[in-house]
């Protein structure tokens, strides 16, 4: 807390400038207007104040707006943004895109603090969704944004949204964000043809059910191992070996290297294994000819 | 730097129940995604839970009835409890925090499950 102490004669500041830096902290308090300061917030960027200086300027504002900054003096606060408080920031009301990015870039290189954690809750919040520029303006500064939301804050993001999505935001994902992610990717990209869907599609396939890989398998997309290792073993275990042939095209012979691993180990185990001989990859471990495969999840429910 | 430090393993008997911690570094972070995995010996990486900043959780199929993730923010400490042990639950369990959008690991801990 600075005293208030009497501003000496002819330092009132008439405007925000360079002079004010050799200005004590008290003669800060004492001299510069509030009202002057908010008007010139863009200025105090351009001019080298103390930590100690910016203190004072944060607490004169604070005391003009005690119910919170308006967005006109948000926007313009510049590295005072590293002085607020996640609880200052709570009582602002941040409407403005162009504001958030100015409050992004202050902090742009470091890990995102909780200030600005606390900045992007209170504007995602009062945009009531994950709208496509946010997300493209939160993800192009800190790609591990998307991943870091529970399913059901991802459930408010609307498929429109997904085409700001790059592949490397949803690297550390987790299986359940993704179910909730794939769908909406499949609406937001249905018009697109063969080729290019899959492209755009891929990144999302961690959460494609059965029928969605089948109708892929139709369609030479030549899904590449690292994709198909990462899909659903439920999703995976009921296609055919002439299905998942179809899906892989060149790739199907990576299926050896990855024989011990999830999900081609398990869907190894569901194939009979004159059908897997049929690749001529020497793939073990398959049902021998002459059993008999009884459906046991389907016996459980009956029973 | 974030650092998780895993902490709990050992030898368990199949059907025992056990509880694994992991030391979070700092608690500052407002928004998080903390996770459980396990890797046995020549397998790929396979996610278990997670649990995320709103208080919501989820499971994968395999552990969905027996294991239960939990977060103690005032010790930051991030839990797994495992019951029903199967040998097949033999791993290194990892924990991995989403945190602030970025990602960091633990370095493992050892569970095995045999009689």
């Known amino acids: 807390e600075v005293e208030k102490t009497a501003c000496p004669s002819g330092k009132k500041a008439p405007e925000i400038d360079e002079s004010l830096i050799f200005y004590k902290k008290w003669e800060l308090e004492a001299c510069v207007d509030a009202a002057l300061l908010a008007t010139q917030m863009d200025r105090v960027n351009a001019i080298p104040f103390t930590y100690e200086q910016l203190d004072v300027l944060k607490h004169k504002l604070d005391e003009l707006y005690p119910q919170g900054y308006p967005e006109s003096v948000i926007q313009h606060l510049g590295y005072l943004f590293l002085k607020m408080s996640p609880e200052d920031i709570r009582k602002w009301n941040v409407t403005s895109l162009e504001t958030l990015k100015a409050l992004l870039e202050v902090n742009k290189g470091h890990e995102m603090s909780p200030q600005v954690a606390t900045l992007i809750d209170r504007f995602v919040k009062g945009r009531g969704q994950l709208d496509k520029d946010t997300l493209d303006t939160l993800t192009a500064f800190y790609p591990g944004y998307l991943c870091s939301l529970s399913p059901e804050e991802l459930s408010s993001v609307p498929p429109s949204s997904i085409w700001a999505v790059r592949p490397q935001d949803l690297d550390t994902c987790d299986p359940r964000q993704l179910d909730v992610l794939y769908p909406k990717a499949r609406l937001a990209f249905q018009n697109m043809n063969g080729s290019e869907y899959f492209v755009k599609i891929q990144s999302f396939l961690g959460g494609a059910p059965t029928e969605d890989l089948k109708a892929l398998s139709q369609q030479n997309v030549s899904m590449d191992l690292a994709t198909f290792m990462k899909l659903r073993t439920d999703a995976v275990l009921p296609l055919t070996v002439a299905e998942v042939q179809k899906l892989l095209g060149p790739h199907v012979e990576g299926l050896k290297a990855e024989e011990r691993h999830r999900p081609v180990r398990d869907w190894i185990l569901r194939q009979r294994q004159d059908d897997l001989d049929t690749l001529g990859l020497g793939l073990q471990g398959g049902i021998p000819n002459g059993y008999l495969v009884l459906d046991l999840s389907m016996q459980e429910a009956l029973s | 730097q974030l650092q998780l430090v895993e902490s709990g393993g050992g030898l368990v008997q199949p059907g025992g129940s056990h509880r694994l911690s992991c030391a979070v570094s700092?608690?500052?972070?407002?928004?998080?995604?903390m996770r459980w995995y396990r890797q046995a010996p020549g397998k790929e990486r396979e996610w278990l839970t997670s649990?995320?900043?709103?208080?919501?959780?989820a499971y994968a199929d395999s552990v969905k009835d027996r294991f239960t993730i939990s977060l103690d923010n005032a010790k930051n400490m991030l839990y797994l409890q495992m019951n029903s042990l199967k040998p097949e639950d033999t791993a290194v369990y990892y924990c991995n925090a989403n945190v602030d959008s970025k990602a960091y690991w633990g370095q493992g801990t050892q569970v095995t499950v045999a009689s």
């Open positions: 649990i995320y900043s709103d208080g919501s959780s």
């Open positions: 700092v608690s500052t972070f407002t928004r998080y995604a």
